[in-house]
């Protein structure tokens, strides 16, 4: 008794797929595989398959049902913090070759990394024109202010909304200040936060307000405090710089905007007699902490002149170092003071039309605004590598 095995039905490739090998007929133990076109993947029911091969059985049937070649779907793209996504190919279209466009919230954010255009590729990932699978980054625009010029020298002016949107009020022990960098860092003076270096959560950080005692402000909390390793507390003010990492990003708007860090070319805007602006809630001429945010426009002082002013007692020799810059009037009367510590001395970069931090309020004479004495500020440009390292590492 002998029997001939039945040939199997000719395999019809699914749409967007092909059969291999192609034979005139398929008999017992013959097999075929299905390969999908680029951008399509094998599916059996709802389940994806890595590969598909069917074998012809003795009864003339295939051992597996024909799969489908289903178009790859990258799925809804991830939300972009401080940005949005647009569907360019069609509303909600997320399949192979679909295009989406990420963009950042206008005015206050700018896109880093790439142009924001992503395509759904055959591997199922949204991919930028540079081949990146990760999201672009919306970085806050820095140095925007309602003030457009440094102007002439005057002091004790009340700040208006949007004038110093990087201004941060730091409470915790004493009143101090800082300046917002990016959307989750605060630049300040080491001496202002030294006591809290091991208890970062004790710092009460407020921004987006003009009035020191106002209940209307944006609250931020500290995750970590980074004091410059070269700073020695109670032994001068060299390296008087610190960074506070916030535990959450703040939302950038016209009242909360980071200050720019100085570019390499920044020193050309910080020469002797160039005007910088210091702001804060520190002591005023009346001897009390200011209720309203105040600012003063003051000129940079020749470094040798400043060094000489602080060579005489009670100041120890070498008080003014190359890591400091001085600002103020020889006649006195315009100065930062206690309570302003950690705040930014800012300058207008006339090329970029953005404000940048040139100095950090650090120290000065016992009597603020004293004639022949000047406010001393940490020279931020000397610390750009340190700042960038901390921010990139943490």
């Amino acid at each position: 008794y002998t029997s001939t095995a039945q040939p199997c039905p000719y395999p019809m490739a699914p749409p967007n797929g092909h059969v291999s090998p192609v034979q005139a007929k398929y008999i017992l133990k013959d097999s075929f595989s299905i390969f999908c076109e680029t951008g399509y993947e094998l599916l059996q029911g709802h389940l994806p398959l890595k590969s598909f091969t069917a074998v012809c059985q003795k009864d003339g049937s295939w051992d597996r049902p024909m799969p489908a070649c289903s178009i790859v779907d990258c799925g809804p793209p991830d939300d972009l913090p401080s940005g949005r996504v647009e569907y360019i190919t069609g509303p909600g279209v997320t399949t192979y070759k679909a295009v989406i466009q990420y963009s950042c919230e206008e005015t206050f954010y700018t896109m880093k990394v790439n142009d924001g255009k992503y395509v759904c590729e055959a591997d199922g990932f949204w991919t930028s024109s540079k081949g990146e699978k990760s999201l672009p980054v919306c970085e806050p625009v820095c140095g925007l202010s309602a003030r457009t010029t440094g102007g002439r020298i005057y002091g004790g002016q009340k700040a208006k909304p949007g004038d110093f949107p990087w201004q941060v009020l730091i409470l915790g022990g004493t009143t101090a200040a800082g300046a917002l960098l990016y959307d989750n860092w605060v630049l300040t003076a080491a001496h202002a936060v030294y006591e809290q270096k091991h208890d970062a959560s004790a710092l009460d950080i407020r921004m987006g307000t003009l009035k020191r005692l106002s209940p209307h402000y944006t609250q931020a909390w500290s995750e970590a405090v980074f004091i410059h390793e070269g700073y020695t507390h109670d032994a001068g003010f060299d390296n008087d710089i610190a960074l506070i990492k916030l535990n959450n990003k703040v939302v950038i708007n016209s009242n909360i905007t980071p200050i720019c860090l100085p570019r390499k070319e920044a020193e050309s805007f910080m020469r002797t007699d160039d005007i910088g602006t210091a702001s804060g809630w520190g002591l005023t001429q009346r001897g009390f902490l200011a209720r309203n945010l105040m600012y003063v426009d003051i000129p940079i002082v020749d470094h040798q002149k400043c060094t000489a002013a602080y060579e005489k007692p009670p100041y120890p020799r070498g008080s003014v170092t190359a890591n400091m810059l001085c600002a103020g009037l020889e006649s006195g009367g315009k100065d930062s003071c206690r309570g302003d510590s950690g705040g930014a001395l800012v300058f207008l970069d006339s090329e970029t039309e953005r404000w940048f931090v040139g100095g950090i309020v650090s120290w000065g004479s016992m009597n603020c605004g004293e004639a022949g004495q000047y406010g001393v500020y940490t020279k931020v440009i000397n610390y750009i590598p340190w700042i960038e390292n901390i921010i990139s590492d943490f």
């Epitope: 178009i71 809804p76 647009e86 569907y87 069609g90 509303p91």
Partner: antibody, heavy 116, light 111 residues
Framework: QVQLVESGGGVVQPGGSLRLSCAAS????????IHWVRQAPGKGLEWVAY????????FYADTVKGRFTISRDNSKNTLYLQMNSLRAEDTAVYYC?????????WGQGTTVTVSS | EIVLTQSPATLSLSPGERATLSCRAS??????????IHWYQQKPGQAPRLLIY???NLESGIPARFSGSGSGTDFTLTISSLEPEDFAVYYC?????????FGQGTKLEIK
């Protein structure tokens, strides 16, 4: 809560124009694509047009292409539909509806009647 | 364009009964990961309301008696036990490509 409020409907003669508005609140308007959908009296739903979140991509049903223009003003949280060369068959309740992938929120609609 | 055909046009049932509404697409509206069919309920004088998205996901705030299933070209909306407020018109809609289209609707009425 999310709210979409349409306005601008009314009676217009064939060949006339009308501009519909949809005021949005309760969500970040600039982050979402928005659609116009219409429903003729006693009939089913018909998708009319879509505009992406930033306004750079727009799509239309063939029945309105070249006559209707969808636009948005993200600073005002408002969607618009400029309807020109109106026909009797454009008579319907016009709804604006939120989202890029399906219609998760709808306005209550504004009625457009095209009649001589 | 993709044509969606709903059946039946009218469904007469009593409260407590199970309702099964069908929606058939003229071509596949399923990808490797998603099924691009959504279901809406509309009552007289009201705007439609989203019930089910991507064929089987229940929209928040919608009772669990509503469920969706299907893939490829055939989809189903099921209401496990009808409540008086469920009697309305039900539409399926695809978002596979533009133009997005709706089915002609199924009217669910009290028997």
């Amino acid at each position: 809560q999310v709210q979409l409020v349409e306005s601008g409907g009314g009676v217009v003669q064939p060949g006339g124009s009308l501009r519909l508005s949809c005021a949005a609140s309760g969500f970040t308007f600039s982050n979402f694509g928005i659609h116009w959908v219409r429903q003729a009296p006693g009939k089913g739903l018909e998708w009319v047009a879509y505009i992406s979140s930033g306004g750079s991509a727009v799509f239309y049903a063939d029945t309105v292409k070249g006559r209707f223009t969808i636009s948005r003003d993200n600073s005002k949280n408002t969607l618009y539909l400029q309807m020109n060369s109106l026909r009797a068959e454009d008579t319907a309740v016009y709804y604006c509806a939120k989202s890029d992938r399906y219609f998760d929120y709808w306005g209550q609609g504004t009625t457009v009647t095209v009649s001589s | 364009e993709i044509v969606l055909t709903q059946s039946p046009a009218t469904l007469s049932l009593s409260p407590g009964e199970r309702a099964t509404l069908s929606c058939r697409a003229s071509q596949s509206v399923s990808s490797s990961s998603y099924r691009y069919i959504h279901w809406y309920q509309q009552k007289p004088g009201q705007a439609p309301r989203l019930l089910i998205y991507y064929a089987s996901n229940l929209e928040s705030g919608i009772p669990a008696r509503f469920s969706g299933s299907g893939s490829g070209t055939d989809f189903t909306l099921t209401i496990s036990s009808l409540e008086p407020e469920d009697f309305a018109v039900y539409y399926c809609q695809h978002s596979w490509e533009t133009p997005w289209t709706f089915g002609q609707g199924t009217k669910l009425e009290i028997k």
